[in-house]
Amino acid sequence: IVLRPSRVHNSEENTMRALTLKDILNGTFSYKTFFPNWISGQEYLHQSADNNIVLYNIETGQSYTILSNRTMKSVNASNYGLSPDRQFVYLESDYSKLWRYSYTATYYIYDLSNGEFVRGNELPRPIQYLCWSPVGSKLAYVYQNNIYLKQRPGDPPFQITFNGRENKIFNGIPDWVYEEEMLATKYALWWSPNGKFLAYAEFNDTDIPVIAYSYYGDEQYPRTINIPYPKAGAKNPVVRIFIIDTTYPAYVGPQEVPVPAMIASSDYYFSWLTWVTDERVCLQWLKRVQNVSVLSICDFREDWQTWDCPKTQEHIEESRTGWAGGFFVSTPVFSYDAISYYKIFSDKDGYKHIHYIKDTVENAIQITSGKWEAINIFRVTQDSLFYSSNEFEEYPGRRNIYRISIGSYPPSKKCVTCHLRKERCQYYTASFSDYAKYYALVCYGPGIPISTLHDGRTDQEIKILEENKELENALKNIQLPKEEIKKLEVDEITLWYKMILPPQFDRSKKYPLLIQVYGGPCSQSVRSVFAVNWISYLASKEGMVIALVDGRGTAFQGDKLLYAVYRKLGVYEVEDQITAVRKFIEMGFIDEKRIAIWGWSYGGYVSSLALASGTGLFKCGIAVAPVSSWEYYASVYTERFMGLPTKDDNLEHYKNSTVMARAEYFRNVDYLLIHGTADDNVHFQNSAQIAKALVNAQVDFQAMWYSDQNHGLSGLSTNHLYTHMTHFLKQCFSLSD
């Protein structure tokens, strides 16, 4: 059991109060993290509380303001970016969100040498993406789906691409599906390390079917939003990668990088680009049937002015038991010889581990091993490799940072974080300065988050960057729920769960149980992190027990568990939630007449299927923005796990795994269905079809739509949503208001 530190020292129970829904909706108990914006080995920038941009030098201990809040405010800047030569800063304002990562903004360039904004040849607006070159102060930006280059901020721009068209051709930025399901970025352009070359992707969406939905707004007629969105089995974007010499871009023009023959023979995806040197680049490609990935290392041939990708530098990664990679195919981290690299992929035992590839994947040297998984490679230096894993004490929901000395033989491994603040901190990420001279550790829990600065050679803590003192004080008189992370062993499957228990939990009493589920492939819900959220409130104030269970299909516990759901989504994820509920009932403190389940997105799909499982376990449940049929969801995501919805592939399971097919089974449960009408991700269509099937089956249910809201149901909708769901659950559990 993890006792939150705020409760340990307070014996005066009568001064304590439970969490309220208002606390949660107001974000009263939110925490802060500190990620340095590194600009060298020993310097970083940080935006102070009063909005000055301050440069800190760790070695001298000095700090000074490089950009005042007055300058920031003069253009209403909400973000900034310093040029590597430190002569200019871009200021970002008029932020306008598009999809998950993408947004447009207005950019102003401020000249630090004369303390004035650059006048003449100003940037157009709104810009879709803008970035400095890694050296000097060249600018690349995307405007109206075309890429432009400025040699200096005050120079006129050079237009690199001319074919960009809204919803048709995207240059330097991803289309919807690449942004959400493949790149997970707002950009699709990459500078070479010294800024000599600029690589970019072109996405051609001309033949992609379009999803159209109404945006009601305030006008007399609603607008129609049109997004090229390939659903499972539909025509996909066509991607090409180009590289242009930024010194004399008008000469050779952009050069297309060839696609490996074994990839180009059928539909394929580009998955990532990694620059190795100014004249060597690594591209990763993936077959549409996502069990084969090819990593291709390409070299610039000065004499030919072209990029050569020899077959000898193609490395194939193939999965025979599932899809390639975890959620995404991992990216390589190159070593100093600029040809060998480190990469995470499955070992022979089916656990994701770090491998060192010098010539071929077949001859890869395994760097980590064990019945746990390496999760991220943070940095490779001449003598050290820093990575995170969930090895420590065999808790898959933890993250610790490790250092492997690669300069010595045999390599030695050290856990940097395992014993730093053992009770408070079990889930870390890290941010490294150049050459890993220094690094910041950000601990997310299970105690109150804390960010610290460390020496990259000795690992010594230099200072605390953020310890959330105000939060700690605010929580002193709050009755927080207790949390425990344990596991169930069922039929050779390990089901890790997190249970959130009311503050005065008594094992001899009976409590209503709420299952919170996500359950998507390669996800993890049972994590040792701090959170004061809606379910904390439900436990603290309403006396519910909340449980989260990681079943088959979830991540970081080996391929057997992960790939169990391959080609059959909606089966084992649901079974495992049900199995866990039965085990919880056996524990003796659950009121089996008051069990509910809720989930959002993939979790909405799983909760719907669990409610319609016919087990009689659940009295009620909520699905927020659920997928209802895999034929309605994005090709890149869906086909990764389900194959194609064709007769000769997996159409049968596509049809069998819909929520609509189980409409009759909702008759004996209370079901609340919720969706935003402007959901670009899981389209409102999904809930519309569930509702239609329930009506056709004459099954009563409750529903709520949120007009013009997307998949996140943000702003005032959030308050309404959680208030509405609270009422629904309290009614279901016969709890008085």
């Epitope: 003449g120 040849n121 400025k150 040699q151 200096r152 120079d155 006129p156 050079f158 237009q159 001319f162 074919n163 090409r240 180009f242 010194t247 004399y248 871009p249 008008a250 000469y251 050779v252 023009g253 952009p254 050069q255 297309e256 004499d303 030919w304 002015q305 072209t306």
Partner: antibody, heavy 116, light 108 residues
Framework: QVQLLESGGGLVQPGGSLRLSCAAS????????MSWVRQAPGKGLEWVSA???????YYADSVKGRFTISRDNSKNTLYLQMNSLRAEDTAVYYC??????????WGQGTLVTVSS | EIVLTQSPGTLSLSPGERATLSCRAS???????LAWYQQKPGQAPRLLII???TRATGIPDRFSGSGSGTDFTLTISRLEPEDFAVYYC?????????FGQGTKVEIK
Amino acid sequence: QVQLLESGGGLVQPGGSLRLSCAASGFTFSSHAMSWVRQAPGKGLEWVSAIWASGEQYYADSVKGRFTISRDNSKNTLYLQMNSLRAEDTAVYYCAKGWLGNFDYWGQGTLVTVSS
Amino acid sequence: EIVLTQSPGTLSLSPGERATLSCRASQSVSRSYLAWYQQKPGQAPRLLIIGASTRATGIPDRFSGSGSGTDFTLTISRLEPEDFAVYYCQQGQVIPPTFGQGTKVEIK
């Protein structure tokens, strides 16, 4: 050494068509952007069209819709298909290595005369 | 489009003299996109300068380029007999790329 050799010029009536060719050698033709630049008798230079190594085409407004640039990388040859020719298209047509500038190699040129 | 205006139209000089040719753009041109060419009668143009100031391969060092923004200059420090020709500046900043009308350097 790099060589560019134009051919296909000649006398043509207004409204007529002509196809110019440019045979390239001495460099990796398939990886270079190529352009056509013309020079009317006694006048200056005028860029006409360009094509990327990957095939994207660019045109001057004066020829857009009438001229088509293309390339055959297997034959190391650049083409300019000229339709609906006008008297003002009369010029020496040069093929040049480059996209929008730094034209480092030029052919000797081929004369196109549009006259009735 | 960007209009490039060269001056003077004709420059009459003797071998050994210094030639200064001017090129003015109707709008700002980044140095990276400004080139100079030499053309002799009956011949194709020859690339002299790229990026406003960098000599192309094989160009003698008596040719130099300078300038930025809208004003660029080509200088021939000591005219050789083979330098008498027409010189064109050219911008590749925007499509269409354009050439100046040319400056003729003739023997005085």
